[in-house]
Interface confidence: medium
């Protein structure tokens, strides 16, 4: 089943997010991902937890998952590199780098996204864009076309309140508001983009979606710059 957790959003402008990837298992959407280099997609480590012996591939240049589109191309995965400290039972270090079988053919609909290297928190209240093919309602309806939503960044102290995530949000994580608008199941691994720069990756825990007291949790990519660089080197 798709992992992660866009509720309350709308259909994205087709191909306006050329960095967007669909990580697929046996031909079906599993998680989001973001093209960070010609041959590398960043996603969430937990996405492959249940992949077992299945075929993992990455779809780039897509808006619709099912309809033919000239820019769409499915790439095999040459190599899957989870963060060495990621573990199935925690949300920490939930990052995965997927090396494509070949360099992606770049164009208007396929383009890597610059990612944040300066390890500084995004200012609370900043509106950031999150996109994905995750479920769009509590009944679990999966969209065929890419959805997106703008979410304000939530300060860590509020996110760590006992009524919210109760201290689980480390300096390497960030939160965004989740009041009816939220990332949801199937969005895991997808990008949180602030000011045209990748700031976060949707974590793949089994958090309830759309509840303001359970804000969305995102892995801060700047905190993992050294690891990302070492893998891409």
């Amino acid at each position: 089943p798709p992992r992660g957790r866009i509720l309350g959003g709308r259909e994205a402008e087709a191909h306006a997010r050329p960095y967007m990837a669909s990580v697929q298992l046996n031909g079906a959407h599993l998680c989001g991902g973001v093209l960070v280099a010609e041959q590398w997609v960043l996603s969430a480590a937990h996405c492959l937890e249940d992949a077992a012996d299945g075929k993992v591939q990455v779809l780039l240049g897509a808006h619709s998952l099912s309809q033919p589109e000239p820019s769409k191309r499915l790439y095999d995965v040459l190599r899957a590199v989870p963060h060495p400290d990621s573990q199935p039972d925690t949300i920490d270090h939930d990052l995965l780098l997927l090396q494509l079988s070949e360099k992606a053919t770049l164009g208007p609909a396929v383009r890597p996204l610059p990612w944040q290297r300066v390890d500084r928190d995004v200012a609370p209240g900043t509106l950031c864009d999150v996109a994905g093919w995750g479920i769009v309602n509590h009944a679990g309806r999966r969209p065929d076309s890419l959805q997106h939503v703008l979410l304000p960044v939530l300060d860590r102290a509020t996110c760590n309140r006992r009524t919210h995530h109760d201290g689980a949000i480390t300096e390497r994580l960030m939160c965004a508001e989740s009041n009816r608008r939220d990332s949801c199941k199937g969005d895991s691994g997808g990008p949180l983009v602030c000011g045209g720069v990748l700031e976060g990756v949707v974590t793949s825990g089994s958090r309830v979606c759309g509840n303001r007291k359970k804000p969305g949790i995102y892995t801060r990519v700047a905190s993992y710059a050294a690891w990302i660089d070492s893998v891409l080197a």
């Epitope: 492959l48 077992a52 993992v56 899957a80």
Partner: antibody, heavy 120, light 112 residues
Framework: EVQVVESGGGLVRPKGSLKLSCAAS????????MNWVRQAPGKGLEWVAR??????????YYADSVKDRFTISRDDSESMLSLQMNNLKTEDTAMYYC???????????WGTGTTVTVSS | DVLMTQTPLSLPVSLGDQASISCRSS???????????LEWYLQKPGQSPKLLIY???NRFSGVPDRFRGSGSGTDFTLKISRVEAEDLGVYYC?????????FGGGTKLEIK
């Protein structure tokens, strides 16, 4: 609960045959590659055989020491793994473990093992 | 076949000490896909083996962070920062990069 349970071990004469079985439960058996690993008395571990899932055409792989004598197979409808062992040798005497394999190829679920003794 | 050589054969330690186990492969165990399928397993007396580390340095679920895997190419190390009584047993390295897959001979961690 995720588990695998081996059965079918026993005493067999050299050049004889034996079929080991492994019943899996608590997970989607058909999506996992499965393996047999053995351990001779007082010795280390030895990988024996692997069979991949249907999406990977049930591809099989064997250790050189058992090639052409052992056959690994699976029945996804019954969540069952088997190891048919023919032309057994005394050096095949071991505890045989049924082992599940995760996406990163690691052996994450092991059974408690079934003992095979080859002796005249 | 890839030969996996573990040293030492036996490692006597005091509780709380650091332990280090070496595993050397007879050839590079970098798979053609770029991953290095080097794992570490612990087998406690009378039990089945349990996975500790996969792809050289990734700790498996529930494995304490005092266990650290490192290395590349042909040389790999498992370090246990503060040995506890529950860590005693036989440690095996394993390569899953080249068929036939092979285990190291094992290292017995015991109390000094």
């Amino acid at each position: 609960e995720v588990q695998v349970v081996e059965s079918g071990g026993g005493l067999v004469r050299p050049k004889g045959s034996l079929k080991l079985s492994c019943a899996a439960s608590g997970f989607s058996f058909n999506t996992y590659a499965m393996n047999w690993v053995r351990q001779a008395p007082g010795k280390g571990l030895e990988w024996v055989a692997r069979i991949r899932s249907k999406s990977n055409n049930y591809a099989t792989y064997y250790a050189d020491s058992v090639k052409d004598r052992f056959t690994i197979s699976r029945d996804d409808s019954e969540s069952m793994l088997s190891l048919q062992m023919n032309n057994l040798k005394t050096e095949d005497t071991a505890m045989y473990y049924c082992v599940r394999q995760g996406y990163y190829w690691y052996f994450d679920v092991w059974g408690t093992g079934t003992t095979v003794t080859v002796s005249s | 076949d890839v030969l996996m050589t573990q040293t030492p054969l036996s490692l006597p330690v005091s509780l709380g000490d650091q332990a280090s186990i070496s595993c050397r492969s007879s050839q590079s165990i970098v798979h053609s896909n770029g991953n290095t399928y080097l794992e570490w397993y612990l087998q406690k007396p009378g039990q089945s083996p349990k996975l500790l580390i996969y792809t050289v340095s990734n700790r498996f679920s529930g494995v304490p962070d005092r266990f650290r895997g490192s290395g590349s190419g042909t040389d790999f190390t498992l370090k246990i920062s503060r040995v506890e009584a529950e860590d005693l047993g036989v440690y095996y390295c394993f390569q899953g990069s080249h068929v036939p897959w092979t285990f190291g001979g094992g290292t017995k961690l015991e109390i000094k």
